[in-house]
Interface confidence: low
């Protein structure tokens, strides 16, 4: 027999299928030009000393073979003795180690069998009614195809699925979408309506994330407020990485999960911008304000569930940093300025009330005054901190107030609003005999004592109504009792108490008259 022809004789080896697991498989035959044909196959197992024979049986029942030697591809013409216009059955027999191994048969009409390509270009992936939709451009001159897909997850083997026949310039496939695991897909095509036509190779992997991006399991910690009024947010636990199927490991475009950090600064609501979204890798510095922090995971199908934390405000107070002067025209605050052209946000809220009731005011960018101080003034008519109660004041500063992560805390302190000197006057002053020359003076705590750091001291004044002599006794702000000694029996005294702040002298309480009775001996 000539090598270019199909030889209609018995092949030069015994006809016995070894039934071994190795051997030839995936036989594909198709027309490659007007008069030439090609068959190719794969061989599984050791290739040394293997000879391959392409077998062909015609519809008449006559059979022939081509000797391919060690090659796994063979070309022949329409003059090789194989009928190309009628159905033929082809298979490969491989003679190795004194045994014959056979491939599965393919039955086809060679003339109409065209080599089909898998989807070659960009495969677009989208979500459609809870399923995965893949779409691609039909390879040139190959409209009319059957399409199959196979898919696997990190823990499951390949499963085969059918996209059905396609007959358009674009082809598409609906595939199952997994809720919580990534999948690898491959697609293959074959000629539509051509009996026994060969499948193309599998396409490159298409890596698809789960419908729900994994919920970010992260933990944050926040450092203490530094001298610059900022504290670092640090990530204690990195988000878990998505497990990927084998073909998607390494570079797997499509399965990426991005984690974003959404900051919401709850304090200072009058500032221009309250939220900012950052990449999770870039951990920001925060002021001492209260924040809500959300970590949002998203993939190509959109955002998933987020995880939210509340970062409470840093309530470390600096009672000496803020000077407040109350005049007839209004009130002015002074504090050490941060730098040139700083915008300040002054926030205040009544102590003991819900954080949602904070009020704030934004200053225009200001430079320090000659004494290096920044100021904020308000008139009595504005009503700011006008009620006689304790307010918690926080001042934030930023050179770029539109950038949420550039705010810093200047100071936090307490302030008693309204007419503090009158409101702070101690009430319920009472005098009790203590000994023959002393009395105990008690009073109810001043309203100023509800305001940490505001009450500097109490002063108790005792006046001798006979001699008009006056003595004053300072009392610690935590005490509400003092003993006055060295008093004379039978003399009338008046006692008064006032509460002083660091910048305001209090108003005396109503005078309380008393005297120590003269003791008459029997």
């Amino acid at each position: 027999c000539r090598t270019s022809e199909c030889c209609f004789q018995d092949p030069p080896y015994p006809d016995a299928d070894s039934g071994s697991a190795s051997g030839p498989r995936d036989l594909r035959c198709y027309r490659i030009s007007s008069d030439r044909y090609e068959c190719s196959w794969q061989y599984e197992g050791p290739t040394a000393g293997v000879s391959h024979f392409l077998r062909c049986c015609l519809s008449s029942g006559r059979c022939c073979y081509f000797a391919a030697g060690s090659a796994t591809r063979l070309q022949f013409s329409d003059q090789a003795g194989v009928s190309v216009l009628y159905t033929v059955t082809l298979w490969v027999e491989s003679w190795a180690r004194n045994q014959t191994e056979k491939s599965p048969e393919v039955t086809l009409q060679l003339y109409n069998s065209v080599k089909y390509e898998p989807p070659l270009g960009d495969i677009k992936v989208s979500k459609l009614a809870g399923q995965l939709r893949m779409e691609w451009e039909t390879p040139d001159n190959q409209v009319g195809a059957e399409v199959q897909f196979r898919h696997r997850t990190p823990s499951s083997p390949w499963k085969l699925g059918d996209c059905g026949p396609q007959d358009d310039d674009t082809e598409s496939c609906l595939c199952p979408l997994e809720m919580n695991v990534a999948q690898e897909f491959q697609l293959r095509r074959r000629q539509l309506g051509s009996q026994g036509s060969s499948w193309s190779k599998w396409s490159s992997p298409v890596c698809v994330p789960p419908e729900n991006p994994p919920q970010p399991q992260v933990r944050f910690s926040v450092e203490q407020l530094g001298q610059d009024g900022r504290r670092r947010l640090t990530l204690k636990e990195q988000p878990t990485q998505l497990e990927l199927p084998e073909g998607c490991q390494g570079l797997a475009p499509g399965t990426e999960v991005t984690y974003r950090l959404q900051l919401h600064m709850l304090s200072c609501p009058c500032k221009a911008k309250a939220t900012r979204t950052l990449h999770l890798g870039k951990m920001p510095y925060l002021s001492g304000a209260a924040y809500n922090v959300a970590v949002i995971s998203s993939n190509q199908f959109g955002p998933g569930l987020n995880q939210t934390w509340h970062i409470p405000a840093d309530t470390h107070t600096e009672p000496v940093a803020l000077n407040i002067s109350v005049g007839t025209n209004g009130t002015t605050m002074y504090w050490p300025a941060r730098a040139q052209s700083m915008t300040y946000c002054i926030e205040w809220q009544p102590v003991g009330q819900d954080g949602g009731l904070a009020t704030c005011s934004l200053t225009a960018p200001q430079d320090p005054d000659p004494a290096g101080m920044a100021t904020y003034s308000w008139s009595r008519e504005s009503g700011a901190m006008g009620q006689e109660k304790c307010y918690y004041i926080t001042i934030f500063a930023s050179a770029h107030p539109e950038k949420l992560t550039l705010w810093s805390t200047v100071l936090s302190t307490y302030h008693f609003g309204g007419n503090a000197s009158a409101a702070g006057t101690p009430h319920h002053v009472s005098v009790k005999n203590h000994s023959l020359d002393s009395v105990s003076v008690d009073w109810a705590p001043s309203l100023l004592s509800t305001c940490p750091g505001v009450l500097k001291e109490y002063v108790v004044r005792c006046r001798d109504e006979d001699s008009k002599q006056v003595s004053e006794h300072p009392v610690q702000p935590t005490e509400t009792q003092v003993t006055l000694s060295g008093l004379r029996a039978g003399v009338a005294y008046t006692v008064q108490v006032r509460a002083d702040t660091a910048w305001l002298r209090g108003v005396w309480s109503q005078p309380q008259r008393f005297s120590i009775e003269v003791q008459v001996s029997d």
Partner: nanobody, 118 residues
Framework: EVQLVESGGGLVQAGGSLRLSCAAS????????VAWSRQAPGSQRELVAS???????KYADSVKGRFTISRDNEKKMLYLQMDSLKPEDTAVYYC????????????WGQGTQVTVSS
């Protein structure tokens, strides 16, 4: 849930006409190919006509020139205009939708009976 509901079937004399309708819900209709198939008693189901998402049509040889398939993406409706009906067109007609242009589509309706009397 995907639902395909056929209507318009009935009894008609040979040479007459019928228009079948199919209302789709729960499916992104415009992205799917849609088709009509039929099954006569004792026979296998055969594809009658299909229309791709880009409005390319395909007909079985036995109905070419007599049947017309059309679709309305906005209303999510599929239609089959059947003219010059013959007794051999008697069958249950099913509406199908899915990603293919042939019989093995993803979803089928319950069917509507068409009877052509001579």
């Amino acid at each position: 849930e995907v639902q395909l509901v056929e209507s318009g079937g009935g009894l008609v004399q040979a040479g007459g006409s019928l228009r079948l309708s199919c209302a789709a819900s729960g499916i992104a209709f415009r992205y799917n190919s849609v088709a009509w198939s039929r099954q006569a008693p004792g026979s296998q189901r055969e594809l009658v006509a299909s229309i791709s998402n880009s409005a390319r049509t395909k007909y079985a040889d036995s109905v070419k020139g007599r049947f017309t398939i059309s679709r309305d993406n906005e209303k999510k409706m599929l239609y089959l205009q059947m003219d010059s009906l013959k007794p051999e067109d008697t069958a249950v007609y099913y509406c199908g939708a899915g990603r293919s242009m042939a019989g093995d589509v993803a979803y089928w309706g319950q069917g509507t009976q068409v009877t052509v009397s001579s």
